[in-house]
C-alpha cells in the first residue's frame, strides 16, 4: 500500500481492492480497482 | 443472518494438510461470496481465499495461492478451504465469512463471520 502527505495534514491511504467481476456484469474472475482516501476510482 | 460454523481445524507437521470446512445456515447461501481469513497471533485478519456466489471464480492471496483451495457447494450450504504444503506461517486462526455482492473481496470487511478455527503448523 502507498501512503502520501499532504500539505493539509490528512493522509490518503492508497489501496488495491479485488471485486468479483461476476458480480458487476463480466466474466473474467476477479478484478482490481484502486482505492483512494474511501473512494473506488478503477 | 448467516450463522457460520468452522471445523477442521489442528495441530499439523509442516508439509502437512488440513481441509476446513465451513457451515452455513440461516439465509440463502448463494447470495453471499465467501471467503475465508487467517488471523495471526498478534496480528491483523488477512484473507487468504474466497470464492464467488457461483463457485466460478475464486481468488487467493499470493502467499497460498498453489497451495490452498476453496470451494463451495450451494446444495449443503458449505464451503471448504483446502490447505496442502502448510507451512509454520500459516499458524493461526481461520475464519469464514460471507459477504454480499459487489463488495470488495479482499478486506476483512464482511458482513458474517464464524467464531474461527485453530490450525497450527509445528513439528
Known amino acids: 500500500d502507498a501512503e502520501f502527505r499532504h500539505d493539509s495534514g490528512y493522509e490518503v491511504h492508497h489501496q488495491k481492492l479485488v471485486f468479483f467481476a461476476e458480480d458487476v456484469g463480466s466474466n473474467k474472475g476477479a478484478i482490481i480497482g484502486l482505492m483512494v482516501g474511501g473512494v473506488v476510482i478503477a | 443472518e448467516v450463522q457460520l460454523v468452522e471445523s477442521g481445524g489442528g495441530l499439523v507437521q509442516p508439509g502437512g494438510s488440513l481441509r476446513l470446512s465451513c457451515a452455513a445456515s440461516?439465509?440463502?447461501?448463494?447470495?453471499?461470496?465467501m471467503g475465508w481469513f487467517h488471523q495471526a497471533p498478534g496480528k491483523e485478519r488477512e484473507i487468504v481465499a474466497a470464492?464467488?456466489?457461483?463457485?466460478?471464480?475464486?481468488y487467493y492471496t499470493v502467499s497460498v495461492e498453489g497451495r490452498f483451495t476453496i470451494s463451495r457447494d450451494n446444495a449443503k450450504n458449505t464451503v471448504d478451504l483446502e490447505m496442502n504444503s502448510l507451512k509454520p506461517e500459516d499458524t493461526g486462526i481461520y475464519y469464514c465469512a460471507a459477504n454480499s455482492a459487489g463488495r470488495a473481496i479482499n478486506l476483512p470487511l464482511y458482513k458474517y463471520w464464524g467464531q474461527g478455527t485453530q490450525v497450527t503448523v509445528s513439528s
Open positions: 470464492i464467488s456466489r457461483s463457485g466460478r471464480s475464486t
Open positions: 440461516g439465509r440463502t447461501f448463494s447470495d453471499y461470496n
